[in-house]
Amino acid sequence: RRGAPAEDQDCGRLPDFIAKLTNNTHQHVFDDLSGSVSLSWVGDSTGVILVLTTFQVPLVIVSFGQSKLYRSEDYGKNFKDITNLINNTFIRTEFGMAIGPENSGKVILTAEVSGGSRGGRVFRSSDFAKNFVQTDLPFHPLTQMMYSPQNSDYLLALSTENGLWVSKNFGEKWEEIHKAVCLAKWGPNNIIFFTTHVNGSCKADLGALELWRTSDLGKTFKTIGVKIYSFGLGGRFLFASVMADKDTTRRIHVSTDQGDTWSMAQLPSVGQEQFYSILAANEDMVFMHVDEPGDTGFGTIFTSDDRGIVYSKSLDRHLYTTTGGETDFTNVTSLRGVYITSTLSEDNSIQSMITFDQGGRWEHLRKPENSKCDATAKNKNECSLHIHASYSISQKLNVPMAPLSEPNAVGIVIAHGSVGDAISVMVPDVYISDDGGYSWAKMLEGPHYYTILDSGGIIVAIEHSNRPINVIKFSTDEGQCWQSYVFTQEPIYFTGLASEPGARSMNISIWGFTESFITRQWVSYTVDFKDILERNCEEDDYTTWLAHSTDPGDYKDGCILGYKEQFLRLRKSSVCQNGRDYVVAKQPSVCPCSLEDFLCDFGYFRPENASECVEQPELKGHELEFCLYGKEEHLTTNGYRKIPGDKCQGGMNPAREVKDLKKKCTSNFLNPTKQNSKSNS
């Protein structure tokens, strides 16, 4: 449903838009000489923004620093200097502003303290930064305070001495619950998982760490793993990489019961120089990257079954640099099952790949209509779109932003890219998809910053330039037509676009500074689009769209992971407000099962271009190195297992004789003698 994009020409020009926006543009000049600015939103739909500006002068012996704190409660239209609430203290920017989960209204700022002090100092607010309480800590924090997702009064922090500290009353009082802690994370139900070093230090003991758990904020503990290299949480899975007995390799083990029982994941082991990485996880499954041996810069993506144990190879030669730890793996949140990432070809060129079925199949991104293939293409008529993401940004290419999608702006994906056989180092353009990545169109010429407002009702963009700017572009039809608005007569050096997370707001803040001979002055312009989208959207403004539709004639059209979804989406021609309370209207319907809805169970694989699972020849008649729940047991399988999250019903049910696979657990990861429980008495 899209034509070629146009800027200001033969587009449905919005009447009086300049007057409407001028009346809704608010400038705020920050009266300080700060070198850096950080901005945080406090709560959801509250309109509260905190801005921390810092100015640092490194002197010979000590460094002198000054912070200023500003607060807005109208989405950035006006700011008030509230530095006095934090006693004009210098705030450590490396800790950022620790904002509480959900709408708790909690904020913690960590202050800089003089060298000889007993501990650090924080400023705490629980009323959306209206007031702050100064609290001196009994330790020097190493990390930002971490809120429990379940209870924002519960905090944990690591100290510079590797102590694990916990507060049960939003940082008023603290208790050290364990020493020699390397890494700590909140789990579900206020559980804390952490690794401890036994002998020397976190670095020296890597691979010999112990994994501990406390379910009562440090009263009692349980050792749930030994010989740990690292651990991570993803969805409902707890992962640990564990050193092997016989060599320096390590393997992933998985638990779905907070570490009470573990299973060895059916993934390759990795050596000292390699790594595992959880790319994405949800309640159903996990995407796991396993690094290739050697400094190749790539590895393999595997997708898990519902237990997190059996893995299917999803994508080879997946780009993931060891040096900077960069991967382009992107979850397209505007459409279920869609992910985009990059692969590294034999010739070292980088290519974008997309999956629409949660990693089942990957393909190149379709060439945008009416686009020409660039110099990277061998065939000038056949090529694909390649997306710039984290890796391009890390390589300092002219890419100001990573791909953007929002769950409530269904189907919309915006990204920088080039059209050819591989990612190009030339200046990219901005492309948009309105169907979750199936089709693409050039949205804007050259690199831009962009953001989505009003659940997709407005897209805003600003050109990426070294020169001062004063123009903002916006589109009310998903990037087809663009209007330009001069938001100031005095151009600014642009530093960033800020809009409330969640893409429900109609306000956008343009941040930057003006520079004269000696001073740099921070300034923000907040533009409210409420008068552009004058009326609320009505029933007639929405149209039906079937996600994942590729063949309207096929009865399985739109079926992904066993069901299809019809959405009501805003018509491109409707200029109206979805509004803050907009809820995506979708109607799911279940699809009949086919072999595509099943993955191959342990000991089985799908030969190339086949749909049936066959027994792995190397496993016939062999005992398998596979550990389920840490004990020997028989595992019965018919070779198939439903893909995690698949909701298909009826149709094809892969029936075949049930095999009894004798499993031999070769991991001593949970040697009973190693298990212990302790009380913190």
Epitope: R1, G12, S549, D554, S573
Partner: antibody, heavy 124, light 107 residues
Framework: QVQLVQSGAEVKKPGASVKVSCKAS????????MHWVRQAPGQGLEWMGW????????RYAQKFQGRVTMTRDTSISTAYMELSRLRSDDTAVYYC?????????????????WGQGTTVTVSS | DIQMTQSPSSLSASVGDRVTITCRAS??????LNWYQQKPGKAPKLLIY???SLQSGVPSRFSGSGSGTDFTLTISSLQPEDFATYYC?????????FGGGTKVEIK
């Protein structure tokens, strides 16, 4: 093959109601909108509204709001259009037409399969 | 409602002629314009959708162009079976509206 078969001609008195049926075959009924379009004798085409057979969701032209009701029975792949409080200027040929789909979009691409038409005559 | 104005309302042409029919929308409808052919006593038949895409089974002598507010249907070489009434229709904004029709007659 894909086809839409409509019910036979009707003669009605002013103030009465008429219900026209449209049976679909050769495709997945729920996967396409069903539009209703009418044509008065010697006149052009006039769109009345559509129904999404999958959800039952409807959209009517303002002119017919309150007088028209579009329904469907997915078990027999049939769509219905009922027009009440008939007047003499409702005399027309009534067509059902399948909305053409492009990818996932149900609207915007015209009507690619039409029924043969049902003549409704309103006369006292 | 969006008004669709077709011109001419009727035209006479000979077999082999190149025929052009225009359609103007009262406001921009992007490329959401479709063209139909209707013969007496028959249901309309979709020729062109999305301004310029040829419906499958329709001869290639039919073509469409335009976007925004001005659109054109062209028959490159008129054939005897092409004598009929042609309608444009916008499907961008509800309610869907049709043009008044252009009757192509034999000269």
């Amino acid at each position: 093959q894909v086809q839409l078969v409509q019910s036979g001609a009707e003669v009605k008195k002013p103030g009465a109601s008429v219900k026209v049926s449209c049976k679909a075959s050769g495709y997945t009924f729920g996967a396409y909108y069903m539009h209703w379009v009418r044509q008065a004798p010697g006149q052009g085409l006039e769109w009345m509204g559509w129904i999404n057979p999958n959800s039952g969701f409807t959209r009517y032209a303002q002119k017919f709001q309150g007088r028209v009701t579009m329904t469907r029975d997915t078990s027999i792949s049939t769509a219905y259009m009922e027009l009440s409080r008939l007047r003499s200027d409702d005399t027309a040929v009534y067509y059902c037409a399948r909305g053409k789909r492009s990818s996932g979009w149900y609207e915007g691409y015209g009507m690619d399969v039409w029924g043969q038409g049902t003549t409704v005559t309103v006369s006292s | 409602d969006i008004q669709m104005t077709q011109s001419p309302s009727s035209l006479s042409a000979s077999v082999g002629d190149r025929v052009t029919i225009t359609c103007r929308a009262s406001q921009s409808i992007s490329s959401y314009l479709n063209w139909y052919q209707q013969k007496p006593g028959k249901a309309p038949k979709l020729l062109i959708y999305a301004a310029s895409s040829l419906q499958s089974g329709v001869p290639s002598r039919f073509s469409g162009s335009g976007s925004g507010t001005d659109f054109t249907l062209t028959i490159s070489s008129l054939q005897p079976e092409d004598f009929a009434t042609y309608y444009c229709q916008q499907s961008d904004v509800s309610p869907i509206t049709f043009g008044g029709g252009t009757k192509v007659e034999i000269k």
